[in-house]
């Protein structure tokens, strides 16, 4: 426990935020499921928000959702429709810095 605390303290002194991998563009078919992955790491652990065409993503029960993952965040859209087309952007912040990545879903 003591060493864990020391490691945490060291990390807190050296805050960082990194986009580990740019988001990919995704082309898929109607009715299928698309997943967009926001791969970021940081200290403190970053807060991640999702945007579609510059607006906060509207979650829909059983169809469109996002969740935290080990590597950052994943946005999943089931039963895809043409209306889902657009620019999807994840924005991550650790309270000091901001990084973002954008992908196109078509």
């Amino acid at each position: 426990p003591t060493s864990s605390w020391n490691i945490s303290s060291e990390l807190n002194k050296d805050s960082y935020l990194t986009l580990d991998e740019p988001m990919n563009n995704i082309t898929t078919s109607l009715g299928q499921t698309a997943e967009l992955h926001c791969k970021v790491s940081g200290n403190p652990p970053p807060t991640i928000r999702w945007f579609k065409n510059d607006a906060p993503v509207v979650q829909e029960p059983r169809r469109l959702s996002f969740r935290s993952t080990i590597y950052g965040s994943r946005l999943r859209i089931r039963n895809l429709d043409t209306t889902d087309t657009g620019y999807f952007q994840c924005v991550a912040t650790n309270g000091k810095e901001v990084v973002s990545s954008t992908g196109v879903l078509f």
């Epitope: 510059d54 607006a55 509207v58 043409t82 209306t83 889902d84 087309t85 657009g86 954008t102 196109v104």
Partner: antibody, heavy 119, light 107 residues
Framework: EVQLVESGGGLVQPGGSLRLSCAAS????????IHWVRQAPGKGLEWVAV????????LYADSVKGRFTISADTSKNTAYLQMNSLRAEDTAVYYC????????????WGQGTLVTVSS | DIQMTQSPSSLSASVGDRVTITCRAS??????VAWYQQKPGKAPKLLIY???SLYSGVPSRFSGSRSGTDFTLTISSLQPEDFATYYC?????????FGQGTKVEIK
């Protein structure tokens, strides 16, 4: 400076065809959605079609699906709207417009080109 | 398709007046609404994007706001060059449907 310039409009008979061009400059054409929007005389704006040139992905309004084809030539930085089986109700000023990345809003528009479908 | 119901269809106002135009979306479009100004014989011009963000070069008398699925364009003090037709557009879902337009005329 960003510019979009349409051409190709004119008078055509019902059932005829026309191809509109939208020449783009001043930005990386491949990475922006390019739209066609039309406006019938004295009426409001109607979205027609969109293309994402990097891959050629396309979508159409129901009113033109199967009759109009949107395409792009990234080597010429130009988008096209091929209009077949034209009807009187297709008479309008046709604008091409660029998306304000990554918003869905259209920030740059061409000057428009008039398409008149009449016998 | 999502419907954007814009009101009023026309209004008469004087220079210096405060003008408000509203659009209601038939379902959630988050904050993805744009407003355009169009003058006769000209292409539309972007004024507001993402419901409330002022586009570059647009005078600060123009502003946008959102309350749920209701969106408002406000011109705080109408100027002579503001007499035109205004359109809203939802930009969240395809197709990016437009409102019917509001013509702002001189009283």
């Amino acid at each position: 400076e960003v510019q979009l310039v349409e051409s190709g409009g004119g008078l055509v008979q019902p059932g005829g065809s026309l191809r509109l061009s939208c020449a783009a400059s001043g930005f990386t054409f491949s990475y922006y959605f390019i739209h066609w929007v039309r406006q019938a005389p004295g009426k409001g704006l109607e979205w027609v079609a969109v293309i994402y040139p990097d891959g050629g992905y396309t979508l159409y309004a129901d009113s033109v699906k199967g009759r109009f084809t949107i395409s792009a030539d990234t080597s010429k930085n130009t988008a096209y709207l091929q209009m077949n089986s034209l009807r009187a109700e297709d008479t309008a000023v046709y604008y091409c417009a660029r998306i304000y990345y990554p918003s869905g809003a259209m920030d740059y528009w061409g000057q428009g080109t008039l398409v008149t479908v009449s016998s | 398709d999502i419907q954007m119901t814009q009101s009023p269809s026309s209004l008469s106002a004087s220079v210096g007046d405060r003008v408000t135009i509203t659009c209601r979306a038939s379902q959630s479009v988050s904050s993805a609404v744009a407003w355009y100004q169009q003058k006769p014989g000209k292409a539309p011009k972007l004024l507001i994007y993402s419901a409330s963000s002022l586009y570059s070069g647009v005078p600060s008398r123009f502003s946008g706001s959102r309350s749920g699925t209701d969106f408002t364009l406000t011109i705080s003090s109408l100027q002579p060059e503001d007499f035109a037709t205004y359109y809203c557009q939802q930009t969240y879902w395809y197709p990016g449907t437009f409102g019917q337009g509001t013509k702002v005329e001189i009283k």
